[in-house]
Interface confidence: medium
């Protein structure tokens, strides 16, 4: 006898893991045999859909490999034309081990800004997300929070926040870990120790210190009066993210020295600056309170002028007397390139013998100044025009430093060879006599202020000059 369909096994809720098999059973009693159709979320499942298997005359629906999108309400409907169609429905709950869909990535952030490390997850039940820093669970506080999304937010990032992070997604089915990512906290360059200003004597060595920190460790550059430092030696050391730079200078002129610490943050740079001034203290007069020692001259500039292996006075008021005095001569020597051929050799002889004075080695080494007469010979005969120009420039402040005042002696303050022939030094290169002077064209309107003596020639001279001798 015909019998209307009856569903003897109603559909139940099925829990299934992703990629596993899930089966709904819809047992029907009827005559004739019914047609059974299946829907998911009220959409008909097609018989030829290869993701499903429908067997036992439609009474078994199998999802061959469950996906998270298979979640929903599944219904079976049975109809055999006798009586009405019958329906039974059940839910498929796709259970899912935690999965991290948007893992965290390495982050570089500047100290004080906000950092967000993403960690978006999937899973059923919904996973809880926690974070590990280094090897320890990360504790939340007023600055550090795990957001609803699972992302980690750090307000006002500090240096100590730097490190290795990973997020952990956990539910009843399992645990997922992200790869380890690095949070790098970059810190603007900052100067910890600024260079100090100094007031020093010409020819001193000064070391300027500049210490800076930052992440990445900054580089330090030195600027002298607005330009890159051209001389001096720079020593640098880096320890514990602190860079220490020492600029050693040989002081021949005043200057403003700026230490610039720079580091790079992506495409941008941060810089910090600190400046120090170097000023040159007033000269102590060469003859006053001289402290120093006698040593052989081993420089270069005065090689041809001073006697071979001359014993010269090295003034220890300089940090490195030999170097300082050599540089003094060298600098002044360059000025002499423009003077007349008659003046130049005489000026060179005066210059070298004035800066590298002959030394009397006694118990207290003593410099022997040039005899006044030789100084005046250079000033009033050989170099009268040049001397006037030089004095005028000095008075008008055209020279950059007091170097030239030291380079050229004040003749009137020098001892005369008439007072004590051993108390002053002669210039062997000024090899002339009164006969030569008679033919010498006057260079100045006034006659020499002293009687120029016969100045003895020196057999050891490498050259000799007379005012009537024209040098090219």
């Amino acid at each position: 006898l015909p019998k209307a369909p009856v569903i003897t096994t109603p559909l139940e809720t099925v829990d299934a893991l992703v990629e596993e098999v899930a089966t709904f059973m819809c047992a029907v009693e009827s005559y004739p045999q019914p047609e059974i159709s299946w829907t998911r979320n009220k959409i008909l499942i097609k018989l030829f859909d290869t993701r499903y298997s429908i067997r036992e005359n439609g009474q078994l629906l199998t999802i061959l490999s469950v996906e998270d999108s298979d979640d929903g309400i599944y219904c079976c409907t049975a109809n055999n034309g006798v009586g009405g169609a019958v329906e039974s429905c059940g839910a498929l709950q796709v259970k899912m081990k935690p999965k991290i869909t948007r893992p965290p990535i390495n982050v570089k952030i500047i100290e004080g800004l906000k950092a967000v490390l993403p960690c978006t997850t999937m899973g059923n039940p919904k996973p809880s997300v926690s974070w590990i820093k280094g090897d320890s669970p990360l504790r939340e506080n007023s600055r550090i929070a795990v957001l609803e999304s699972g992302s980690l937010r750090i307000h006002n990032v500090q240096k100590e926040d730097a490190g290795q992070y990973r997020c952990v997604a956990k539910n009843s089915l399992g645990t997922a870990y992200s790869k380890v990512v690095k949070l790098e906290v970059e810190v603007f360059a900052r100067i910890l120790r600024a260079p100090e200003s100094h007031n020093v004597t010409f020819g001193s060595f000064v070391t300027l210190h500049c210490t800076a920190t930052g992440i990445p460790v900054p580089t330090i550059t030195w600027i002298e009066n607005g330009n890159a430092v051209s001389s001096g030696s720079i020593q640098e050391s880096v320890k514990d993210r602190v860079i220490d730079s020492r600029l050693q200078l040989f002081i021949t002129k005043p200057g403003l020295y700026t230490c610039i610490a720079t580091n790079k943050h992506g495409e941008k740079f941060s810089t910090a600056k600190a400046a120090a001034t170097i000023s040159i203290a007033e000269w102590s007069k060469p003859q006053k309170d001289n402290k120093g020692y006698c040593a052989q001259y081993r420089g270069e500039v005065c090689n041809a002028v001073l006697a071979k292996d001359a014993l010269v006075f090295l003034n220890t008021s300089y940090a490195d007397p030999e170097e300082a005095q050599e540089l003094l001569v060298h600098t002044a020597w360059n000025e002499l390139k423009v003077v007349s051929p008659v003046c130049r050799p005489a000026a060179e002889a005066l210059l070298c013998n004035h800066i590298f004075q002959e030394c009397s080695p006694g118990v207290v080494p003593t410099p022997i100044p040039i005899c006044r007469e030789y100084c005046l010979a250079v000033k009033e005969l050989f170099c009268a025009k040049e001397w006037l120009v030089m004095e005028e420039k000095t008075h008008r402040g055209l020279y950059r430093s007091e170097m030239h005042l030291l380079s050229v002696p004040e003749c009137s303050k020098l001892p005369s060879m008439h007072w004590d022939p051993t108390a002053c030094a002669r210039l062997p290169h000024l090899d002339y006599n009164k006969e030569n002077l008679k033919t010498f064209p006057p260079m100045t309107s006034s006659k020499p202020s002293v009687d120029i003596p016969n100045l003895p020639s020196s057999s050891s001279s490498s050259f000799s000059v007379s005012p009537t001798y024209s040098m090219t």
Epitope: A295, R298, G299, E300, D309, L311, E323, L327, H330
Partner: antibody
Amino acid sequence: ELQLVESGGGLVQPGGSLRLSCAASGFTFDDYGMSWVRQAPGKGLEWVSAIPWNGGSTYYKESVKGRFTISRDNAKKTLYLQMNSLKSEDTAVYYCAKRSGRIAFGALDAWGQGTLVTVSS
Amino acid sequence: QAVVTQEPSLSVSPGGTVTLTCGLSSGSVTSSNYPDWYQQTPGQAPRALIYSTNSRLSGVPSRFSGSFSGNKAALTITGAQPEDEADYYCALYMGSGSRNYVFGGGTKLTVL
């Protein structure tokens, strides 16, 4: 960083020639005197030659005078040692060294790592 | 030509004091010789310690000091450290004649 890098060493027969170079960086080359110093295997240091900052004069150890020539090219920041008529006793590591100041005879305050010159038949 | 003389070898205990000297085979060492001192450890280039008798180069520890002792130049290490074990050379400027710079034969210092 101050650096002195020597090159040009090698094996040469007695009577032969070699030219050593020393490339300087990290300091103002033309502000300093320079020197060559050598060290025979297992022996002490021996000063060979010196030149001031401006190349205005040159100085040599007596035994190399007339055979070796020191020179410098301040524009290229390079020091040279031209060695002619080489003898077996010239075999040594040759160091280029920077003087502490302009003069030819200040202390040698920076050294290269040296280049080996071997004179042998 | 004058020969620069040094002790071939010396030893010192860690923390101890040792003085190396530098003399001339004929005559005395004076300030005109500008004595310089260098340290060389095996396989390394030499390093300047002291120049012109007693001026320490930048970065050289204060335990190294230079002076004159009698007619010789001297290098004193006060509070020797194991890393001070090295060869030490003095060098003198010889002004006369051709202006040479002459190294001594070196002193091998052992820190026991």
